[in-house]
């Protein structure tokens, strides 16, 4: 996918982490159960 | 040690293409983001993008949007960045940059100087 | 989007000066700011991230202090070799945006 960032973004967050994406990782999702 | 090299200079006419290369060394090449930044000659710094190696999820600056096309081979651990409809504006230097979500741009690569020039 | 303007564009010192550069951001970064230097004809090396903290390698007279929208790069003893320029740069937020650059030279 692609994202496109200039005029305005909603990337930012209010709580004290940075906004931009996090590292990539290869972890998979377990179902829960 | 972590190392990204880049290839060499190109000199293109206006309205073609450049593809840049950069490999990089050293570390887990899926485990950080690439961004790719450039600095037109006595000009600041300028970010064009980044891609997620991964994924392939791309995040573009808006100017760069329609002309810029950022891919990855993870089985050379490189990424390519390609700049269509060159422009005289686009004289440069191009750096590829692993950006980790701690640190931002924490190692680049020497830079690939690019001159569109008829 | 954001814009970093830092102060002052030029700057000159001497070796064993005491230098501080500014970066404000337009709205809050929180501490997200980033610090490079570069040399004519390098690549831009990374100083200082989320506002204080040195990269690995880098000198202790490096020091970067502020949070929201005002930072600091201080030198607290210039070096022959920290004569170079110095970009800040925020990692808040898409798109990733770095100041005009200030260009520390000899005096």
């Known amino acids: 996918s692609e994202t496109t960032t200039g005029t305005s973004s909603n990337s930012s967050q209010s709580t004290s982490n940075s906004g931009l994406a996090p590292n990539p990782t290869n972890a998979t999702t377990k179902a829960a159960g | 040690q972590v190392q990204l090299v880049q290839s060499g200079a190109e000199v293109k006419k206006p309205g073609a293409s450049v593809k840049v290369s950069c490999k990089a060394s050293g570390y887990d090449f899926t485990g950080y983001h690439m961004g790719w930044v450039r600095q037109a000659p006595g000009q600041g710094l300028e970010w064009m993008g980044e891609i997620n190696p991964i994924t392939s999820d791309k995040t573009f600056n808006q100017k760069f949007k329609s002309r810029v096309t950022m891919t990855r081979d993870t089985s050379i651990s490189t990424a390519y960045m390609e700049l269509s409809r060159l422009r005289s504006d686009d004289t440069a230097v191009y750096y590829c940059?692993?950006?980790?979500?701690?640190?931002?741009?924490?190692?680049w690569g020497q830079g690939t100087t690019v001159t569109v020039s008829s | 989007d954001i814009q970093l303007t830092q102060s002052p564009s030029f700057l000159s010192a001497s070796v064993g000066d005491r230098v501080t550069i500014t970066c404000r951001a337009s709205k809050s970064i929180k501490k997200y700011l980033a610090w490079y230097q570069q040399k004519p004809g390098k690549a831009p090396k990374l100083l200082i991230y989320?506002?204080?903290t040195l990269h690995s390698g880098i000198p202790s007279r490096f020091r970067g202090s502020g949070s929201g929208t005002e930072f600091t790069l201080t030198i607290s003893s210039l070096q022959p070799e920290d004569f170079a320029t110095y970009y800040c740069?925020?990692?808040?937020?898409?798109?990733?945006?770095f100041g005009q650059g200030t260009k520390l030279e000899i005096k």
């Open positions: 940059a692993r950006r980790d979500y701690g640190t931002s741009l924490d190692y």
């Open positions: 989320a506002g204080s």
């Open positions: 740069q925020q990692h808040n937020e898409y798109p990733i945006i």
